[in-house]
C-alpha cells in the first residue's frame, strides 16, 4: 500500500485531516500527549480502520478498549474503507490516560479522498483504475512485470502536413488519439472537497520536453483536447469538481530512448492544501503513474513480408520486373520509387530502416531515416512517413557521415539464445572498423547511441571496414528454416568459390567462362581465375576477414557450424585495400518469406547451366526457399551495390511483445 | 574523356575556410576516382585527398586531416574540397585529377594512385 | 622533405637518354607497383606519363620507360627532345598514413 501522510494529533484542538483511500497514513499520538499521561486508547467511526503496533515486541492488535503504553516504540496507522460524503465526517477519538488525571481526548476528523491516476500498467490494452499503490511508481520487465508504454507520436495522420503528429501541440482526430496512450484520473470527494484543495499534473523538468500530455474535456472528441503538459510546460493546476469523477488524458511521448533518456517518464498528480490562503500550498498526496517509451524494433529476414520499395532509374526496367514478380509470388505490396523522386539514387536499403514500435493498444510501422542523405534523402519523410506510419532519424544531417552510416550497414539477426540469455527479437548487427585509425571508418556514434539505447536488440558490432563499400549486408544475410533455430546464416565464402571451381576444372571444365554473356566485360575462365595467386592471396584476405565475422557472429548469436551455409563468392581488393563482389555478390540478396531475389552470378556454364547458381540452388532449395537469380549486372553490380542494396522491405512485427522480455 | 575544372579558390585569411569544386564535363564523375593534389609557389606536387567513385570512404594527407573534407555530389558531377582552419602552409594551386574506375580489371589496377585526368587548378592564397 | 627522393636536376642533349632516380622505403616503392610518373611544363598541369611503374598512357611517346628495382624506381627517356624539358615528378601508393606520395621533383634541361 502507498505511503500516506502523518498526522499528529494534539489534545488542545480538533484536527483536520484528509486520508487518500489506499494510502497509509502515520498518526503520531505521543509528541502532543500531555505530560503526566502514560497510554492512549483509541475509538473510530465504522469507516476507519486503526493499526497500532508495538515494537519489541513486534506485537499487533486491532482496536477496541486495549490501552496502549505512550513510547516511541508505538505505531499507530490508519486506513480508511470509502470516501467520505462529507468534510469530515469520519472520527478517530484518542483518549490519554495517567495515574492521577481522568482521560484527556484529542480528537481528528477525517475526511476520506478516492485520487488515483491510473494508466495501462498491466498492458492489456485497457486502462483500469488503481488506487494509489506502490508498483505504479516502478517500470518491471518481463511477462510478469507492469507499468504503462508510450509511444512516440511520430507518424503523419494529416497528409496535408509535412510535420510528424508530435511536432504540434494539436489533436488531429480520434486516429491521433490512437496513438497516444490513456491516462485516467479518477476522483471520489465531498462536494466541496476542492475549495480547499487543489490538484496539479505534473512532469519532471528533466523530462517534460520528452512528452505531451492532451485533457480531454467533455466527451473524447478529439477536437475537445488542450494540452495541459509538454516541452513549454510542466505542470498543471487541474479545474476537478466534487464528488465522483473520472477525467482523462491522452499522453504522447516525443523522443526515442537515446543516450541521455533511458525512455522512462512518470506523470504525478499532487494534492496540495490550499485552505489556509495566508500560507503556501501545501502537499498532501501525491501519486504517479511510470511510462516506458516504447523502443524502435528492427524486424529480420525471418519475419513475413509486407511491402517491398525499389526506385525506378535510367535502364533498370528488366530488373523492376523481376522484383516486382518476386514481390508478386511473397504477396507483398510493392512500392516503386519513380526517378524524378530519387534523383538517380537507386540505392534503397541505404536511406533507410523499416522497423515499428508497439503499445498494447496499438502498432505503428517506423521508418529510421538515415543520415546518407542522398538523392533519395526526400523519400521516407514525404513518401513513407504518413497516417500510421511513423518517422524517425538520428545522425548529422549535414556531412560528418561515412559510408557505414548507411543501412546496407544495419542488419539484425532473427531472434537467438545464447547460452542462458534469450534474445526474443534478435540481435542488432552493424559494421565498424576492427581499430580506430587516421582513416578508419565507423558508423556515427549517434546511430550507435541510438540503437543500443532501445534495449530490446543488443546490438553486435561486425568488422565491415574491409570492404570498398563497408556494410554487412556484403559478406551475410539471414533466411528462415524449417528447422533447428528457424533460419540459417548465409555467409560469402571464397574457399567454397576456389572449391567448387577446383572440382570442375578436376571434370574437365577448366576453360567454361564467367561472365559470359556480358557485353564490355573480361570473360575469364575457370583455369585462369584458379591460376591467379594474386586474386587468390586477395581472396585469402577477404576469407580471413569473414572468419572474424563468423566466429564473432558464432559467439554473439550462440550459433553452430550447422546454422551457417557458406555461399561461394569472390572478391577483389581495389584501390586502398578495399574489397568489393568480382562477380555479382549473391549473399546480397531479397528475402521475401521463402522467396530469394539473388544477384545472378554469371558463373561458368557447364552442362547447359551456371555452377554457382547449380550450387547455390542445392544448398538453399532443401530448406523450401525458391531461388530467383536477378540480373543486376550493369544497373547494380558495376556501381558497387546489389539487389539487397536497392530494395528494402517492410516486414511483419513480432508476435513477441518486447516488455515481455528482460533486456 | 572527362574534363575537371576547378573553382573556389581565393585570398583567405589565417583560420578562414574555402570550398573548392571540380565540375566535370564530357563524362559521368561517378565512374571515377578523384584525388586532389596541390603545389606550393615554386615548390613540387603534393597529394591532399581522394574519394573513391563508390563514394564510400575517403583518404587525406597527414597535413591536412581533420581540417579538410573531400565530398561528391554525382547529380551535379562535382566533387569538393572543405577547406576549413586554413594556415599559410596551405597556400597553393590546387589541383583537382581523375582516373577512370575500370570495373573490368581482374584485381586492383592503383588508379586511385595515379591521376590521368588534370584540371587547370585553382589558387588559394592564406595570408593576413 | 618529400617522402620519394629525387635528384634535383638531371640534363642531357638532343638525341641522348637520362634516367631520372624515386626512392623510396619497402613500405612504398618497394611493397607496391603503384609507381607513377609525371611531367609538368612551366605554368601547366601535371601530365600521367608512366603507372604501374612501367605502363605508358594511350598517347604518350615509346621514349618514355619506367622501371623498379627494391625500392628505387627509374624514369628513363631515350632519344631526348626539346619539349622534354620540364619538370618530372614521381609518385607511389604507401603503406603511412599518407597513402600517396610524391618525390620532390627533377628539373629535366635539355642542353
Known amino acids: 500500500m502507498a505511503q500516506g501522510t502523518l498526522i499528529r494529533v494534539t489534545p488542545e484542538q480538533p484536527t483536520h485531516a484528509v486520508c487518500v483511500l489506499g494510502t497509509l497514513t502515520q498518526l503520531d499520538v505521543c509528541s502532543s500527549a500531555p505530560e503526566d499521561c502514560t497510554s492512549f486508547s483509541v475509538n473510530t467511526s465504522p469507516g476507519v480502520v486503526v493499526d497500532i503496533a508495538h515494537s519489541p515486541p513486534a506485537k499487533k492488535k486491532s482496536t477496541g478498549s486495549s490501552t496502549w503504553p505512550l513510547d516511541p516504540g508505538v505505531e499507530v496507522t490508519l486506513t480508511m474503507k470509502a470516501a467520505s460524503g462529507s468534510t469530515g465526517d469520519q472520527k478517530v477519538q484518542i483518549s490519554y490516560h495517567g495515574p492521577k488525571t481522568p482521560p484527556v481526548k484529542a480528537l481528528l476528523y477525517l475526511t476520506g479522498v478516492e485520487i488515483s491516476l491510473s494508466a495501462d500498467i498491466t498492458r492489456t490494452g485497457k486502462v483500469k483504475p488503481t488506487r494509489a499503490v506502490e508498483d505504479k511508481r516502478t517500470w518491471t520487465w518481463g511477462p510478469c512485470g507492469q507499468g504503462a508504454i508510450l509511444l512516440v507520436n511520430c507518424d503523419r495522420d494529416n497528409p496535408e502536413s509535412s510535420a510528424m503528429d508530435c511536432e504540434d501541440d494539436e489533436v488531429l482526430d480520434s486516429k491521433d488519439l490512437k496513438d497516444m496512450s490513456l491516462m485516467t484520473l479518477s476522483t471520489k470527494t465531498p462536494q466541496d472537497f476542492f475549495t480547499r484543495h487543489t490538484l496539479v499534473l505534473h512532469v519532471a523538468r528533466s523530462e517534460m520536453d520528452k512528452v505531451r500530455v492532451f485533457q480531454a474535456t467533455r466527451g473524447r472528441l478529439s477536437s475537445r483536447c488542450r494540452v495541459v503538459l509538454g516541452p513549454k510546460q510542466p505542470s498543471h493546476y487541474l479545474m476537478v469538481p466534487g464528488g465522483k469523477h473520472n477525467m482523462d488524458f491522452y499522453v504522447e511521448a516525443l523522443a526515442f530512448p537515446d543516450t541521455n533518456f533511458p525512455g522512462l517518464i512518470t506523470l504525478t498528480v499532487s494534492m496540495l492544501d490550499t485552505s489556509k490562503l495566508e500560507l503556501p500550498e501545501a502537499v498532501v498526496f501525491q501519486d504517479s503513474v511510470v511510462f516506458r517509451v516504447a523502443p524502435w524494433i528492427m524486424t529480420p529476414n525471418t519475419q513475413p513480408p509486407q511491402e517491398v520499395y525499389v526506385c525506378s532509374i535510367f535502364e533498370n526496367e528488366d530488373f523492376l520486373k523481376s522484383v516486382t514478380a518476386l514481390a508478386m509470388q511473397a504477396r507483398c505490396k510493392l512500392t516503386i520509387c519513380p526517378e524524378e523522386e530519387n534523383m538517380d539514387d537507386q540505392w534503397m536499403q541505404d536511406e533507410m530502416e523499416i522497423g515499428y514500435i508497439q503499445a498494447p493498444h496499438k502498432t505503428l510501422p517506423v521508418v529510421f531515416d538515415s543520415p546518407r542523405n542522398r538523392g533519395l534523402k526526400e523519400f521516407p519523410i514525404k513518401r513513407v512517413m504518413g497516417p500510421d506510419f511513423g518517422y524517425v532519424t538520428r545522425g548529422p544531417q549535414t556531412g560528418g557521415v561515412s559510408g557505414l552510416d548507411s543501412f546496407g550497414n544495419l542488419e539484425v539477426s532473427p531472434p537467438v539464445t545464447v547460452g542462458d540469455k534469450e534474445y526474443p527479437l534478435g540481435r542488432i548487427l552493424f559494421g565498424d572498423s576492427c581499430y580506430p585509425s587516421s582513416d578508419s571508418r565507423e558508423m556515427h556514434q549517434a546511430l550507435q547511441d541510438f540503437l543500443s539505447a532501445q534495449q530490446v536488440q543488443a546490438p553486435v558490432k561486425l568488422y565491415s571496414d574491409w570492404l570498398t563499400v563497408g556494410h554487412v549486408d556484403e559478406f551475410l544475410s539471414f533466411v528462415p528454416a524449417p528447422d533447428r533455430k528457424g533460419f540459417r546464416l548465409l555467409l560469402a565464402s571464397p574457399r567454397s568459390c576456389y572449391k567448387l571451381f577446383q572440382e570442375q576444372q578436376n571434370e574437365g571444365h577448366g576453360d567454361a567462362l564467367l561472365f559470359q554473356g556480358i557485353k564490355k566485360k573480361n570473360q575469364q575462365k575457370i583455369k585462369n581465375i584458379l591460376s591467379n595467386t594474386t586474386l587468390r592471396e586477395h581472396n585469402s584476405f577477404v576469407e580471413r576477414c569473414i572468419d572474424w565475422n563468423r566466429e564473432l557472429l558464432k559467439r554473439e548469436l550462440g550459433l553452430a557450424e550447422s546454422d551457417i551455409i557458406d555461399i561461394p563468392q569472390l572478391f577483389k581488393l581495389k584501390e586502398f585495400s578495399k574489397a568489393e563482389a568480382f562477380f555479382p555478390n549473391m549473399v546480397n540478396m531479397l528475402v521475401l518469406g521463402k522467396h530469394l531475389g539473388i544477384p545472378k552470378p554469371f558463373g561458368p556454364i557447364i552442362n547447359g547451366r551456371c555452377c554457382l547458381e547449380e550450387k547455390v540452388c542445392s544448398l538453399l532449395e532443401p530448406l523450401g526457399l525458391h531461388c530467383t537469380f536477378i540480373n543486376d549486372f550493369y544497373t547494380y553490380h558495376i556501381r558497387h551495390g546489389e539487389v539487397h542494396c536497392g530494395t528494402n522491405v517492410r516486414r511483419k512485427p513480432f508476435s513477441f511483445k518486447w516488455w515481455n522480455m528482460v533486456p | 574523356q572527362v574534363q575537371l575544372v576547378e573553382s573556389g579558390g581565393g585570398l583567405v585569411k589565417p583560420g578562414g575556410s574555402l570550398r573548392l569544386s571540380c565540375a566535370a564535363s564530357g563524362s559521368t564523375l561517378s565512374d571515377y576516382f578523384v584525388s586532389w593534389i596541390r603545389q606550393a609557389p615554386g615548390k613540387g606536387l603534393e597529394w591532399v585527398s581522394f574519394i573513391p567513385s563508390a563514394n564510400t570512404f575517403t583518404y587525406y594527407a597527414d597535413s591536412v586531416r581533420g581540417r579538410f573534407t573531400i565530398s561528391r555530389d554525382n547529380a551535379k558531377n562535382t566533387v569538393y574540397l572543405q577547406m576549413n582552419s586554413l594556415r599559410a602552409e596551405d597556400t597553393a594551386v590546387y589541383y583537382c585529377?581523375?582516373?577512370?574506375?575500370?570495373?573490368?580489371?581482374?584485381?586492383?589496377?592503383?588508379?586511385?594512385?595515379?591521376?590521368?585526368?588534370w584540371g587547370r587548378g585553382t589558387l588559394v592564397t592564406v595570408s593576413s | 622533405q618529400s617522402a620519394l627522393t629525387q635528384p634535383r636536376s638531371v640534363s642531357g642533349s638532343p638525341g641522348q637518354s637520362v634516367t631520372i632516380s624515386c626512392t623510396g622505403t619497402r613500405g612504398d616503392v618497394g611493397r607496391y607497383n603503384h609507381v607513377s610518373w609525371y611531367q609538368q611544363h612551366p605554368g601547366k598541369a601535371p601530365k600521367l606519363i608512366i603507372y604501374?611503374?612501367?605502363e605508358r598512357p594511350s598517347g604518350v611517346p615509346d621514349r618514355f620507360s619506367g622501371s623498379k628495382s627494391g625500392n628505387t624506381a627509374s624514369l628513363t627517356i631515350s632519344g631526348l627532345q626539346a619539349e622534354d624539358e620540364a619538370d618530372y615528378y614521381c609518385?607511389?601508393?604507401?603503406?603511412?598514413?599518407?597513402?600517396?606520395?610524391f618525390g620532390g621533383g627533377t628539373k629535366l634541361t635539355v642542353l
Open positions: 604501374n611503374v612501367y
Open positions: 609518385s607511389s601508393h604507401s603503406r603511412s598514413s599518407t597513402p600517396v606520395l
Open positions: 585529377s581523375s582516373a577512370n574506375d575500370d570495373v573490368d580489371d581482374i584485381v586492383a589496377p592503383g588508379r586511385g594512385y595515379y591521376m590521368d585526368v
